[in-house]
């Protein structure tokens, strides 16, 4: 099969890093400079990827494989192949429109990236909580009032109250 | 189709600061760089400098210590800010939305001209 | 005084093929692509050729580029006195991390 499709186009001969050059009777012709093929068979080479400004080169560009890219410190990837770089934020905040935002009472974010989360609520597992939260840290939840003191109530402690303003996110 | 649009006034005094805003429209500000451009009147184009979406700048050596370009997102808009101006910073001001994968700059807004000048 | 050197003026007669070329460093045409842009009198700049060779929908296949070494070079055969315009190289440089232009070529359709 291979060599009847080779007979029928001689375009399929052509390997990863050239490309079937219709103006030179389909012969292949090594990809320009700043492009590549990595599949055998092109009749175009693509254009390869520039990681400038924010972007930073990982990976330099050859004739069979597109450049990959990360981001300037202070930034981090977004999408597929790092399509685009989103600023970093402290931990304790998360990234609006308006920039970086402490995370309202009730919520945290222990990364640089990513949105504020509400605390765990330990009551929904029947236990209580150990140490509070913190704009960086969840609530870390401990053993229920009832496995601590035998008999004792097993309701847990209100949450603490919100700061006028604020709710979680 | 996305359309950039200049505003801010046409004639700034001597000494004073520039200030422009290219409001973004029919298109996403994010993924993109957006550039500040100038043609003095019969004069070279020149880059003023460029700002990622997501707050990344960088500026003609040239120019760096009287400029500032910021972005605002949440009115898809993007301003420049020239201060100390003087006669030679009479020109035409473009602002462009410049792909960020291959570096081109595939929309320009029509210009608005600054005229320094007491 | 610009990066990317270009000849002020270049021109031709309706049916000619004329070249337009663009001179760099290293820093710049020799390790990026290059754009090309054209500009009508009293207009904004518009992207004519992108990464050395590509062409924009809706530009015409009368328009090529080509890039060697550190220079590059906008071609344009079948000049129309339509394309009578002002012509810009432009790339990014890597020692400015940005982006750098020619100063731009006169075409004048005879």
């Known amino acids: 099969f291979e060599r009847t499709r080779s007979l029928q186009d001689p375009c399929s001969n052509c390997p990863a890093g050239t490309f079937c050059d219709n103006n030179r009777n389909q012969i292949c012709s090594p990809c320009p400079p700043n492009s590549f093929s990595s599949a055998g068979g092109q009749r175009t080479c693509d254009i390869c990827r520039q990681c400038k400004g924010v972007f930073r080169t990982r990976k330099e560009c050859s004739s069979t494989s597109n450049a990959e890219c990360d981001c300037t410190p202070g930034f981090h990837c977004l999408g597929a192949g790092c399509s685009m770089c989103e600023q970093d934020c402290k931990q304790g905040q998360e990234l609006t429109k308006k920039g970086c935002k402490d995370c309202c009472f009730g919520t945290f974010n222990d990364q640089k990236r990513g949105i504020c989360r509400p605390w765990t609520n330990c009551s929904l597992d029947g236990k209580s909580v150990l140490v509070n939260g913190t704009k960086e840290r969840d609530v870390v939840c401990g053993p229920s009032p009832a496995d601590l003191s035998p008999g004792a109530s097993s309701v847990t402690p209100p949450a603490p109250a919100r700061e006028p303003g604020h709710s979680p996110q | 189709q996305v359309q950039l649009q200049e505003s801010g006034p046409g004639l700034v005094k001597p000494s004073e600061t520039l200030s422009l805003t290219c409001t973004v429209s029919?298109?996403?500000?994010?993924?993109?760089?957006w550039s500040w451009i100038r043609q003095p009147p019969g004069k070279c184009l020149e880059w003023i400098g460029y700002?990622?979406?997501?707050?990344?700048?960088n500026y003609n050596p040239s120019l760096k210590s009287r400029v500032t370009i910021s972005v605002d997102t949440s009115k898809n808009q993007f301003s420049l800010k020239l201060s100390s101006v003087t006669a030679a910073d009479t020109a035409v001001y473009y602002c462009?939305?410049?792909?960020?994968?291959?570096?081109?700059?595939?929309?320009w807004g029509q210009g608005t001209t600054v005229t320094v000048s007491s | 005084q610009s990066v990317l050197t270009q000849p002020p003026s270049a021109s031709g007669t309706p049916g000619q093929r004329v070249t337009i070329s663009c001179s760099g460093s290293?820093?710049?045409?020799?390790?990026?692509?290059v754009n090309w842009y054209q500009q009508f009198p009293g207009t904004a700049p518009k992207l004519l050729i992108y990464?050395?060779?590509q062409r924009p929908s809706g530009v015409p296949d009368r328009f090529s580029g080509s890039k060697s070494g550190t220079s590059a070079s906008l071609a344009i055969s079948g000049l129309q006195s339509e394309d009578e315009a002002d012509y810009y190289c432009?790339?990014?440089?890597?020692?400015?991390?940005?982006?750098?232009f020619g100063c731009g070529t006169k075409l004048t359709v005879l």
């Open positions: 700002i990622y979406y997501s707050g990344f700048t």
């Open positions: 990464s050395n060779n």
């Open positions: 029919g298109g996403s500000i994010s993924g993109y760089y």
């Open positions: 462009t939305r410049d792909h960020s994968h291959y570096y081109y700059m595939d929309v």
């Open positions: 290293s820093s710049n045409i020799g390790s990026n692509t």
């Open positions: 432009a790339g990014w440089d890597d020692s400015l991390n940005g982006p750098v």
